[in-house]
């Protein structure tokens, strides 16, 4: 699996899941999260040539045909497969709320 | 939605499902399929700005920050949403075959 | 573009009621935090309470805590500031504010809204 216990060990040029931190203010411009300041949300990198962890029939056909067709700008794309919630803490005025925000950090990627 | 309703009708320039053909000999060097020759399969393509069909919560995110660091290699890519399957006609010997292939076509797209 | 219009202010008197009105556009659909403010003259901006558009949670200040309601009408893309028993010192230039990135909760602090109304003048007098 294209997962962080493979894709952070390894120096994989092809699609896999990359590090990445992202503060809530700087990058994001959002003030409401109080806790925590930022998060590491990783990202999806690289390319997806054919049999790379393609996702389904239509993406081994698409592979395949980037292969016999190497010009053309029709190819698999490296997204998110597994994605995990992210807890935070917010404020209701100043009351403070706890919520988990859903499908905020990617474990892997797959060849969409 | 970034189907072919929309898509094939407009001009859009981001992420939507764009026209293509493939041809299963020229294209991908498959033999073993007798019908069709080849199918209109279609693609996407296109940006993933913020608020353009965003897939899920960490699709958002991303966009964002893409927004706020426009050279990041970071961003959403436009994937198909929709797929639906082809009918085939193939041979075992000289025993005509007909199979469905799930997930050939692509019908509309979203940013992940 | 985002844009809050606030309207509903005016005289009345001691013990009086107004609504306040903030119409808000530009925003993701039921997200983001409304938050209320007012300025009296020669006086610090007060945060009087707020709402989150998405789950209608709020938030009120102590000194208007029973006398001012926030409620909000996501179809309508207002919200509103309800307030009874209207004293002198309730006097000012009232104002809505928005943080539309908000999908949870809501500020008491003016220095999280991005985007503010232009105002409505409230006066209590007899």
């Known amino acids: 699996a294209l997962d962080t216990n493979y894709c952070f060990s390894s120096t994989e040029k092809n699609c896999c899941v990359r590090q990445l931190y992202i503060d809530f203010r700087k990058d994001l411009g959002w003030k409401w999260i109080h806790e925590p300041k930022g998060y590491h949300a990783n990202f999806c990198l690289g390319p997806c040539p054919y049999i790379w962890s393609l996702d389904t029939q239509y993406s081994k056909v698409l592979a395949l045909y980037n292969q016999h067709n190497p010009g053309a700008s029709a190819a698999p794309c490296c997204v998110p497969q597994a994605l995990e919630p992210l807890p935070i803490v917010y404020y209701v005025g100043r009351k403070p709320k706890v919520e988990q925000l859903s499908n905020m950090i990617v474990r892997s990627c797959k060849c969409s | 939605a970034l189907d072919t309703n929309y898509c094939f009708s407009s001009t859009e320039k981001n992420c939507c499902v764009r026209q293509l053909y493939i041809d299963f000999r020229k294209d991908l060097g498959w033999k073993w399929i007798h019908e069709p020759k080849g199918y209109h399969a279609n693609f996407c393509l296109g940006p993933c700005p913020y608020i353009w069909s965003l897939d899920t919560q960490y699709s958002k995110v991303l966009a964002l920050y893409n927004q706020h660091n426009p050279g990041a290699s970071a961003a959403p890519c436009c994937v198909p949403q929709a797929l639906e399957p082809l009918p085939i006609v193939y041979y075992v010997g000289r025993k005509p075959k007909v199979e469905q292939l799930s997930n050939m076509i692509v019908r509309s797209c979203k940013c992940s | 573009e985002v844009q809050l219009v606030e309207s509903g202010g005016g005289e009345v008197r001691p013990g009086g009621s107004l609504r306040l009105s903030c119409v808000v556009s530009?925003?993701?659909?039921?997200?983001?935090?409304i938050g209320w403010f007012r300025q009296a003259p020669g006086q610090e901006r007060e945060g009087l309470g707020c709402?989150?558009?998405?789950?209608?949670?709020?938030w009120s200040a102590d000194s208007v805590k029973g006398r001012f309601t926030i409620s909000r009408d996501n179809v309508r893309n207002t919200v509103y500031l309800q307030m009874n028993a209207l004293k002198p010192e309730d006097r000012g230039v009232y104002y809505c504010?928005?943080?539309?990135?908000?999908?949870?909760?809501?500020?008491?602090?003016?220095?999280?809204?991005?985007?503010w109304g232009q105002g409505t003048q409230v006066t209590v007098s007899s």
């Open positions: 709402i989150a558009r998405k789950d209608g949670d709020t």
């Open positions: 504010a928005g943080d539309p990135s908000a999908l949870y909760g809501c500020s008491d602090r003016s220095s999280e809204y991005q985007y």
């Open positions: 530009g925003f993701t659909k039921d997200y983001g935090a």
